[in-house]
C-alpha cells in the first residue's frame, strides 16, 4: 500500500501535485492513479459541466516529505 | 493549517434560491490538483455529495439535482460558491465544503444549517 | 453510480473492546475508500484515506483494510472519545459517494 501523497516540484515552477512518485493526477476520475493505468479516452461521466481532456498531470522530480509521513500533504510551495 | 468555514441564509422559503458560500485557508485553488466541493446532510440522515469545483475550473454535479445547482469559485478570495434555486422542504440539511487534492475529501467545515419553511 | 453499503447502521461496544465497521461497493473501487468520523456536534473528520492510510493527527487505535469492494474500518481499543457516527466513502469514480453510516455508540 502506497504512503502518503507528497508534494513533487515540476520542471518549470515549484508547483506541488497531490500525487505520490509515479502516480498522475487522472483528469477523467479526478484523483490520483498509476501513471501506467491511465485508461483509453472515453466520455466523460454523465453529470459533468464539460469534456475532459485525457491527460494527465505528470510528476516529474519528487520533493520528498519526511520519513514515515502518512498524512495528506498541505501545499507547502504555494 | 487547513480550515473551511460555510456560511448561509439559515432559513428560505421554497421556491427561492440558496446562496452558499465557502471561505477557506492553508491552501490555494490555483493548486493542480485541488477542489473544493459540497456536501449536504438532512437531519438524522446520510451524507449527499452535490457538486465540486477543481482548480482548472471544471465542474461537476450530483445528476439527480444538475439543473438546480450552480458551482462557482473565486480563487483569489479563496471562496467557493453553490446556489442551489427553486429550494423545497426537501433541501432542508446541513451543508458541508470539503476540500480535495488528489485522494478525496480530506478537510471538511463546520457546516451551515438551512430549514425551508413556508 | 457506485452505490456504498454500510449494513450495520448501528453497533453497540464497551470501551476497550475492538470495532469492526464494514462498507461494500457495488462494483470494483480499487482501494479508492476513505473513511469519516461524524461526532454528535456534526463535525466530520477524515481518519483513514486510500483504504489505509492513517490521516494526520488520528490515533493509531484506527485502522483499515479491504480490496475490491469490501472495506472495513477497525478500531482496536475504544474509547469514549470514538462515539460518533463513521461514513465510507469511495472516491474511484465521479460521482463520489458515501454509506448510509454506522453509528457507534457505548453498551
Known amino acids: 500500500m502506497r504512503r502518503g501523497p507528497r508534494s513533487l516540484r515540476g520542471r518549470d515552477a515549484p508547483a506541488p501535485t497531490p500525487c505520490v512518485p509515479a502516480e498522475c493526477f487522472d483528469l477523467l476520475v479526478r484523483h490520483c492513479v498509476a501513471c501506467g493505468l491511465l485508461r483509453t479516452p472515453r466520455p466523460k461521466p454523465a453529470g459533468a459541466s464539460s469534456p475532459a481532456p485525457r491527460t494527465a498531470l505528470q510528476p516529474q522530480e519528487s520533493v520528498g516529505a519526511g520519513a514515515g509521513e502518512a498524512a495528506l500533504p498541505l501545499p507547502g510551495l504555494l | 493549517q487547513v480550515t473551511l468555514k460555510e456560511s448561509g441564509p439559515g432559513i428560505l422559503k421554497p421556491s427561492q434560491t440558496l446562496s452558499l458560500t465557502c471561505s477557506f485557508s492553508g491552501f490555494s485553488l490555483s493548486t493542480s490538483g485541488m477542489g473544493v466541493g459540497w456536501i449536504r446532510q438532512p437531519s438524522g440522515k446520510g451524507l449527499e455529495w452535490l457538486a465540486h469545483?477543481?482548480?482548472?475550473?471544471?465542474?461537476y454535479y450530483n445528476s439527480s439535482l444538475k439543473s438546480h445547482l450552480t458551482i462557482s469559485k473565486d480563487t483569489s478570495r479563496n471562496q467557493v460558491f453553490l446556489k442551489i434555486t427553486s429550494v423545497d422542504t426537501a433541501d432542508t440539511a446541513t451543508y458541508y465544503c470539503?476540500?480535495?487534492f488528489g485522494y478525496g475529501l480530506d478537510y471538511w467545515g463546520q457546516g451551515t444549517t438551512l430549514t425551508v419553511s413556508s | 453510480d457506485i452505490q456504498m453499503t454500510q449494513t450495520t447502521s448501528s453497533l453497540s461496544a464497551s470501551l476497550g473492546d475492538r470495532v469492526t465497521i464494514s462498507c461494500s461497493a457495488s462494483?470494483?473501487?480499487?482501494?479508492?475508500l476513505n473513511w469519516y468520523q461524524q461526532k454528535p456536534d456534526g463535525t466530520v473528520k477524515l481518519l483513514i484515506y486510500y483504504t489505509s492510510s492513517l490521516h494526520s493527527g488520528v490515533p493509531s487505535r484506527f485502522s483499515g483494510s479491504g480490496s475490491g469492494t469490501d472495506y472495513s474500518l477497525t478500531i482496536s481499543s475504544l474509547e469514549p472519545e470514538d462515539i460518533a457516527t463513521y461514513y465510507c466513502?469511495?472516491?474511484?469514480?465521479?460521482?463520489?459517494?458515501f454509506g448510509g453510516g454506522t453509528k457507534l455508540e457505548i453498551k
Open positions: 469545483i477543481w482548480w482548472d475550473d471544471d465542474k
Open positions: 462494483q470494483d473501487i480499487s482501494n479508492y
Open positions: 466513502h469511495q472516491f474511484s469514480e465521479l460521482p463520489w459517494t
Open positions: 470539503a476540500r480535495s
